[in-house]
């Protein structure tokens, strides 16, 4: 089959990062500088994508594949090929698909980025709440009420949370 | 907080050239386009084009290609649209806007008005 | 170059209705479309980016949906303050677009 399509179109044996140059008796041509190819037989080659303003280049373009962009300090990409760039969001809050949200009460992100994750359960690990949370910081858990006797250990480190999961993009 | 401040209006003979100015301010000028947009009376919205503060690379439309010049000045942080020979359909309103693929801060505009 | 229409071009509404303005795209645009409110003197200020992102601010009883050509605004509630001219318009591809616009009036 591959035989026969190349007689029916001379164009089918030009290889990525080429063109066939109807031009030139439909030899296979170098794309031209800025320009690539990424599939066979093509007629002519795709401009490459320029990142510019708050896009940057994450991966050069090459004759056989686009540019990549990705998005400077502070925003992240938006869409599988980065077409939009949106702001981090702030600590105390999470992105959702319509953009950032207020942590919920009950809930904190101490980062710009991820998802609120549950306050630390004290009561879980037998000990009582020291610090109570907000949207920004976990509660910090101290000694249960019994052992606040003289001579016990202060303040304990909170439980792990859940691992955080992925922001919707 | 980001701002767009941009030059008063003008009025212009058909003919002439006019350049409209649009400072920034509130953010990193050299880190996002400026677009153009224009707005005739009582009409919509009509992209004229871009510039890259960072490397003075510009994009435009082919409509203005031949007539607009979009420059900057990064030291004062501040974006110009020139439009030369002035036609009287040229006349409207002028917006520059910051791009993060869509326009999220708007200058306030600049009525150009064309006539002789 | 993409061609972005809106329809319809104008509607009368009642505080307090639903009001729903589409935007088609001439080819596939996928997620690219943000909308904009305008009013009379007054510069264009973002409502939604990348389909169906609030911009800050904006009350969430807007709210964007639809992907490749078609796409929708929708106000759950109209306010008396949301009379105005909202416009579409693409960045998927050079030059950017923008759809004829809708004006939203009071009945």
């Known amino acids: 089959f591959e035989r026969t399509r190349s007689l029916q179109d001379p164009c089918s044996n030009c290889p990525a990062g080429t063109f066939c140059d109807n031009n030139r008796n439909q030899i296979c041509s170098p794309c031209p500088p800025n320009s690539f190819s990424s599939a066979g037989g093509q007629r002519t080659c795709d401009i490459c994508r320029q990142c510019k303003g708050v896009f940057r280049t994450r991966k050069e373009c090459s004759s056989t594949s686009n540019a990549e962009c990705d998005c400077t300090p502070g925003f992240h990409c938006l869409g599988a090929g980065c077409s939009m760039c949106e702001q981090d969001c702030k600590q105390g809050q999470e992105l959702t698909k319509k953009g950032c949200k207020d942590c919920c009460f009950g809930t904190f992100n101490d980062q710009k980025r991820g998802i609120c994750r549950p306050w630390t359960n004290c009561s879980l690990d037998g000990k009582s709440v020291l610090v109570n949370g907000t949207k920004e910081r976990d509660v910090v858990c101290g000694p249960s009420p019994a052992d606040l006797s003289p001579g016990a250990s202060s303040v304990t480190p909170p439980a792990p949370a859940r691992e955080p999961g992925h922001s919707p993009q | 907080q980001v701002q767009l401040v941009q030059s008063g209006a003008e009025v212009k003979k058909p003919g002439a050239s006019v350049k409209v100015s649009c400072k920034a301010s509130g953010y990193t000028f050299a880190g996002f386009e400026m677009h153009w947009v224009r707005q005739a009376p009582g009409q919509g919205l009509e992209w004229m084009g871009a510039i890259d503060p960072k490397t003075g690379g510009t994009d435009y439309n082919q409509k203005f290609k031949d007539r607009v010049t979009m420059t900057r000045d990064t030291s004062i942080s501040t974006a110009y649209m020139e439009l030369s020979r002035l036609r009287s359909d040229d006349t409207a309103v002028y917006y520059c806007?910051?791009?993060?693929?869509?326009?999220?801060?708007w200058g306030q505009g600049t009525l150009v008005t064309v006539s002789s | 170059d993409i061609q972005m229409t809106q329809s319809p071009s104008s509607l009368s509404a009642s505080v307090g209705d639903r009001v729903t303005i589409t935007c088609r795209a001439s080819q596939d645009i996928r997620s690219n479309l943000n909308w904009y409110q305008q009013k009379p003197g007054k510069a264009p200020k973002l409502l939604i980016y990348y389909t169906s992102r609030l911009h800050s601010g904006v009350p969430s009883r807007f709210s964007g949906s639809g992907s490749g050509t078609d796409f929708t605004l929708t106000i759950s509630s109209l306010q008396p303050e949301d009379f105005a001219t909202y416009y579409c318009?693409?960045?998927?591809?050079?030059?950017?677009?923008f759809g004829g616009g809708t004006k939203v009036e009071i009945r």
């Open positions: 318009q693409q960045s998927e591809k050079l030059p950017r677009t």
């Open positions: 806007a910051r791009d993060l693929g869509y326009f999220d801060v």
